[in-house]
């Protein structure tokens, strides 16, 4: 699920997640990540794949939390 631009609020431009992927992304395909703006209606972690795709994920998902800890360390 790609991120979507939101023009609402003073933080334009930014990206917000409105839906999350259902599936765990293979770890080796992920290059980077960032958190969406705190003013978005839903929290989100966006993973950037090695092919340049942006994938919205749920910060509550355990795999997302595990991957972030792994990436912070590495």
């Amino acid at each position: 699920t790609k991120t979507e631009s939101s023009s609402r609020g003073p933080y334009h431009p930014s990206e917000c997640c409105f839906t999350y992927t259902t599936y765990k992304i293979p770890r080796q395909r992920i290059m980077d990540y960032y958190e969406t703006n705190s003013q978005c209606s839903k929290p989100g972690i966006v993973f950037i794949t090695k092919r340049g795709h942006s994938v919205c994920t749920n910060p509550s998902d355990k795999w997302v939390q595990d991957y972030i800890k792994d990436m912070k360390e590495n």
Epitope: P26, Q28, W63, Q65, D66, K69
Partner: antibody
């Protein structure tokens, strides 16, 4: 060639403590892997016990019935252990370790060990 | 927790026949389903993942289908070597991390 091997299975008395070890050959655990312990009582189906993330956090997850009595740990980049306490006859089973290698969006166990037998009897 | 209900518990078919095994999840599992074959004294062997993707080296006589809560494993042109117990499995790493196996189906080849 990648493989998993379980060890530590034994005949023990009720109330005993036992540690099982799962050793990986041909690969080391990474942020792609989740390692699982699954057991199978004689003539019965498969039942999961615990799971550990192969990456830095080493996060652990347990079946609700296993919390407090079973402990999964990553003791090196190629070994995972399962500590079992207060064993009862109901814990008699073959214990398997398995890997979810995380190579696709669809999770599955792509590698299993041959299993180690734990028998609890007085 | 998600419960996987597998039917039938046992099935007997002749060589060359077809076997169909069903697995029903207690909620939508979004095709996060795998099928395994287990023979006595051996660990389970992966057959299918993602509900329909054949694992490497598995004959095309095996096929999987389904979505939502209903999934099926079909074995065509049954061979003696297919005599085994088959399990479905759901895995999630979402708000909970868990896996749930079906109760198993024993396939007897006559």
């Amino acid at each position: 060639c990648q493989s998993l091997e379980e060890s530590g299975g034994d005949l023990v008395k009720p109330g005993a403590f036992l540690t099982l070890t799962c050793t990986a050959s041909g690969f080391s655990f990474s942020g792609s892997d989740y390692m699982w312990w699954v057991r199978q009582a004689p003539g019965k189906g498969l039942e999961w016990i615990a799971c550990i993330y192969g990456g830095y956090s080493g996060s652990t997850y347990y079946a609700s019935w296993a919390k407090g009595r079973f402990t999964i740990s990553k003791t090196s980049s190629t070994t995972v252990t399962l500590q079992m306490t207060r064993l009862t006859a109901a814990d008699t089973a073959i214990y398997f370790c398995a890997r979810d290698g995380g190579v696709t969006h669809f999770s599955h166990f792509d590698l299993w060990g041959q299993g180690t037998l734990v028998t609890v009897s007085s | 927790d998600v419960v996987m209900t597998q039917t039938p518990a046992s099935v007997s078919e002749p060589v060359g026949g077809t076997v169909t095994i069903k697995c029903q999840a207690s909620e939508d599992i979004y095709r996060l389903l795998a099928w395994y074959q287990q023979k006595p004294g051996q660990p389970p062997k992966l057959l299918i993942y993602g509900a329909s993707t054949l694992a490497s080296g598995v004959p095309s006589r095996f096929s999987g289908s389904g979505s939502g809560t209903e999934y099926t494993l079909t074995i065509n042109d049954l061979e003696c070597a297919d005599a085994a117990t088959y399990y479905c499995q759901y895995i999630t790493y979402g708000s909970d991390v868990l896996t749930a196996f079906g109760g198993g189906t024993e396939v007897v080849v006559k």
